[in-house]
């Protein structure tokens, strides 16, 4: 039986040109996590596997870096980076848990650097 | 030039454990990658065995798991593979490879060259 | 496990033919998929990376693309040393599967 949830930091917005920190936690759950999958919309941004570290998808390599911890950091943002992002948990030996973040990149109002939006936390269980 | 090479008996009897090993050379096993075993059944496809990371944890296809244990000798620059409880579903080519997880994700950029291991009474 | 099924499983085409192979996931991979390249009684080679990346010193005829379930595999100009079989391999999950491969010959 799957008994985790995925926490995320939900709904965020961050200004054109600036970066942000994706980030999601797993809890209520003692199963092994091997892999977690970062992807926006239908692209593979990156995998970090538990034992062989961080792959970072080629076409995102000039602007996405990996962590801090499983998390991923989108930097200079463009409003094209507006949407859905999805942290994808995959242990053992529950099997797949989703969580979601919606971000929102917003035309710069003159000041640098990201701003953080509501934190809505989303509970997903299994994807597959 | 990394190159690895594929030895071991080329014929093990059932019920018995077959033993490989692979050599790794121009690159220290010690310093980066994964070191993975594949195999190739006679005229059908490819089959993950199995991986050795250079830390030293494994992880295991979940259908072989239970017979398959891969380790690292870093003494010799190279690892090995050990499945036991052999039947003739078993022979196959049995190549090693290396993994650059960072650089190409699961996919393997350096292959040995194969070595055929017929089980057979 | 994430099954790759290959179409077609053999196919005889002419040399400077555009040959296309397909590959189909059970379950969406994203981009995470490679392709090899096995001549007879060889080491597969590393030909694909991430769906769509070459890899280093493969020449520009390969080509990888498609993302999800459905990927294609192209020789733009098949050439006599391209006689090989191919083989498509995901990464999407910790356990690696590979296709049942596609052999190539010339017509």
């Known amino acids: 039986m799957m008994t985790g949830t995925i926490e995320t930091t939900g709904n965020i917005s961050a200004e054109k040109g600036g970066s942000i920190i994706l980030q999601c936690h797993l809890s209520s759950t003692t199963a092994q996590v091997t892999q977690v999958n970062w992807e926006q919309q239908d692209q593979l941004l990156a995998i970090c596997n538990a034992d062989l570290g961080w792959h970072i998808s080629p076409s995102f390599k000039d602007r996405v870096a990996p962590g801090p911890g499983l998390g991923l950091t989108l930097q200079s943002l463009t409003v094209n980076d507006t949407g859905e992002y999805f942290c994808i948990y995959h242990t053992y030996p529950d099997g797949t848990y989703t969580g979601r973040i919606f971000l929102e990149v917003l035309e710069s109002s003159g000041g640098g650097g990201a701003g953080g939006g509501g934190h809505h936390h989303h509970h997903h269980h299994h994807h597959h | 030039q990394v190159q690895l090479q594929e030895s071991g008996p080329g014929l093990v009897k059932p019920s018995e454990t077959l033993s490989l090993t692979c050599a790794v050379y121009?690159?220290?096993?010690?310093?980066?990658?994964?070191w993975h075993w594949i195999r190739q059944p006679p005229g059908k496809g490819l089959e993950w065995i199995g991986y050795v990371h250079y830390s030293g944890s494994t992880n295991y296809n979940p259908s072989l798991k239970s017979r398959v244990t891969i380790s690292v000798d870093t003494s010799k620059n190279q690892f090995s593979l050990k499945l036991s409880s052999v039947t003739a579903a078993d022979t196959a080519v049995y190549y090693c490879?290396?993994?650059?997880?960072?650089?190409?994700?699961?996919?393997?950029?350096?292959w040995g060259q194969g070595t055929l291991v017929t089980v057979s009474s | 496990d994430i099954q790759m099924t290959q179409s077609p499983s053999s196919l005889s085409a002419s040399v400077g033919d555009r040959v296309t192979i397909t590959c189909k996931a059970s379950q969406d991979v994203r981009t995470a998929v490679a392709w090899y390249q096995q001549k007879p009684g060889k080491a597969p080679k590393l030909l694909i990376y991430?769906?769509?990346y070459r890899y280093t010193g493969v020449p520009s005829r390969f080509s990888g693309s498609g993302s999800g379930t459905d990927f294609t595999f192209t020789i733009s100009s098949l050439q006599p040393e391209d006689i090989a079989t191919y083989y498509c391999q995901q990464y999407y999950s910790t356990q690696w599967t590979f296709g049942g491969g596609t052999k190539l010959e010339i017509k």
């Open positions: 490879a290396r993994m650059d997880y960072g650089n190409y994700g699961g996919a393997m950029d350096y």
């Open positions: 991430s769906a769509s």
């Open positions: 121009g690159y220290s096993i010690t310093s980066g990658y994964s």
